[in-house]
């Protein structure tokens, strides 16, 4: 992929994009913004979906981790011809629908929504958009909004999780490139390492989970460390401390040598999880080691 910062988090990422008539002459800028951002999420466990809305919401690319399908999805996105009204709620409906299906499958993967719009939403449309964004949140999603040009920041702060989850682009569509780094930094929740990565069988330990974005939760009291043991049992532990780049967590006592615990983090009290390829293994420790 292209250079610069990247995100290694394993979660489901939904782009909800305004393709109403008002973006007709700016679709290229929207496309390049999404294309460049999409390439920065590089975990093999990350899945992505492209949703567009105008007078209707359409899922242009259904949730997939397949990089070839994502490439084809981006090609389809480039061909979009904007037109119609700004029914943003329809975009959120299409995201909620997919989250609902995935939850039902038992995956409970964390979901991040990045919704982009220009212009103000008229009263009814704002009400519906806020309602549908709330439904996505009820299903466990973190919602970010990108507002370009004539957007209403107060509206977007209510559609997004908070004012801090809104990215205002006041200088028009060409300035979208300038917020890629800050969106990546804010929307990326990733687990990079665990210290120690090997623990003694049968003993209690604390684990430092290194990563990024752990304080992006709406409520840091709802952050959990999760240990999926030998691909079967999952144990959730409340961290002693939550910082943006690390969590301090009690590790479960793993009785036998050679047991493996895959590390996950929940930002919403176990409703959904950020996955990683970080594994903690047990070893035999003799006395005094």
């Amino acid at each position: 992929e292209d250079g610069g910062p990247a995100c290694y988090g394993g979660f489901d990422l939904y782009f909800i994009l305004d393709k109403s008539g008002s973006v007709l002459h700016h679709w290229n800028e929207i496309y390049y913004f999404v294309e460049q951002l999409a390439h920065k999420f590089i975990s093999p466990q990350l899945r992505m979906s492209f949703i567009v809305f105008s007078t209707r919401g359409t899922t242009l690319m259904k949730l997939t981790e397949d990089r070839e399908q994502i490439r084809q999805g981006l090609e389809e996105l480039q061909k979009v011809l904007p037109g119609g009204d700004t029914y943003m709620h329809e975009g959120f409906e299409r995201a909620s629908e997919q989250i609902y299906y995935e939850n039902r499958q038992g995956y409970r993967t964390a979901s991040v929504i990045i919704a982009l719009t220009d212009g103000e939403l008229h009263e009814d449309l704002f009400f519906y958009s806020e309602r549908e964004a709330n439904r996505s949140r009820d299903l466990g999603a973190i919602v970010y909004c990108v507002g370009v040009k004539d957007f209403n920041e107060t509206q977007l702060a209510r559609i997004a999780d908070s004012k801090d989850h809104v990215f205002p682009v006041n200088d028009g569509f060409q300035a979208l490139q300038g917020i890629i780094h800050s969106i990546l930094k804010k929307s990326c929740i990733e687990i990079l390492a665990a210290e120690p990565s090997t623990i003694c069988a049968g003993e209690s330990f604390q684990v430092v989970v290194r990563g990024n974005g752990f304080r992006h939760a709406r409520n840091v009291d709802r952050v959990l460390c999760s240990f999926k043991i030998n691909d079967s049992v999952t144990l959730n532990e409340k961290p002693f401390s939550v910082e943006d780049t690390y969590l301090l967590c009690p590790a479960p006592i793993l009785k036998e040598v050679g047991m493996k615990a895959a590390l996950q983090v929940s930002m919403n009290d176990g409703l959904s999880f950020i996955s990683s390829s970080v594994i903690i293994t047990t070893t035999h420790c003799s006395d005094g080691s």
Epitope: R56, T58, T59, E93, E97, Y100, Y101, N103, R131, R135
Partner: antibody, heavy 117, light 106 residues
Framework: QVQLKESPGALVKPTQTLTLTCTFS??????????VSWIRQPPGKALEWLAH???????SYSTSLKTRLTISKDTSKNQVVLTMTNMDPVDTATYYC?????????WGQGTLVTVSS | DIELTQPPSVSVAPGQTARISCSGD??????VHWYQQKPGQAPVLVIY???KRPSGIPERFSGSNSGNTATLTISGTQAEDEADYYC?????????FGGGTKLTVL
């Protein structure tokens, strides 16, 4: 396991109001994301969706019947109630309640409502 | 709302593959679900989210969806599969059903 049961069928006179109750077990309406829908099927015809109530008490209605329908829930009793005003013989159908959000994974057995004078 | 169109009837010989279509404008951009209904019984969900099979549904039932057509495929059709089949999707806070297809196993 999940079960839904509609209140017994009825003979309703034209212009009267129909009230149907769906009593369910095996799931909770306080859990986020789901909900309960009402669907009907006139004899020998297709399924027609009527109304849905979500866990957070949001409601949605069939556009063509919106003015005649009201859906409500009693979470403590595990019940969802549908009322339909101004009944007409064309409303004769089997009425089903079903669990789901974007699709319906469990259905009641249905109750036959006949509208006739 | 989107309109879902199904053929009124489809016939298939036992052991053969039955395909039931559900068409609508750009239906590939939304999710489609399928129900089986036998006479005098309530519908049963056989496929959801285009191609996912609920537990307890035989593997011979599969689904696909792209462009303007979603398809329910029953491979190795059995006599017990004779029923009405309905496609359904979700559009603008409404659930929308197709008109139904009667599958006859010859």
């Amino acid at each position: 396991q999940v079960q839904l049961k509609e209140s017994p069928g009825a003979l309703v006179k034209p212009t009267q109001t129909l009230t149907l109750t769906c009593t369910f077990s095996g799931f909770s309406l306080s859990t986020s994301g789901g909900g309960v829908s009402w669907i009907r099927q006139p004899p020998g015809k297709a399924l027609e969706w009527l109304a849905h109530i979500y866990s957070n008490d949001d409601k949605s209605y069939s556009t063509s019947l919106k003015t005649r329908l009201t859906i409500s829930k009693d979470t403590s009793k595990n019940q969802v109630v549908l009322t339909m005003t101004n009944m007409d013989p064309v409303d004769t159908a089997t009425y089903y309640c079903a669990r789901g959000g974007y699709f319906l994974d469990y259905w009641g057995q249905g109750t036959l409502v006949t509208v006739s004078s | 709302d989107i309109e879902l169109t199904q053929p009124p009837s489809v016939s298939v010989a036992p052991g053969q593959t039955a395909r039931i279509s559900c068409s609508g404008d750009n239906i590939g951009g939304i999710y489609v679900h399928w129900y089986q209904q036998k006479p005098g019984q309530a519908p049963v969900l056989v496929i959801y989210a285009d191609s996912k099979r609920p537990s307890g549904i035989p593997e011979r039932f599969s689904g696909s969806n792209s462009g303007n057509t979603a398809t329910l495929t029953i491979s190795g059709t059995q006599a017990e599969d004779e029923a009405d089949y309905y496609c359904q999707s979700y559009d603008i806070t409404s659930l929308v059903f197709g008109g139904g297809t009667k599958l006859t196993v010859l």
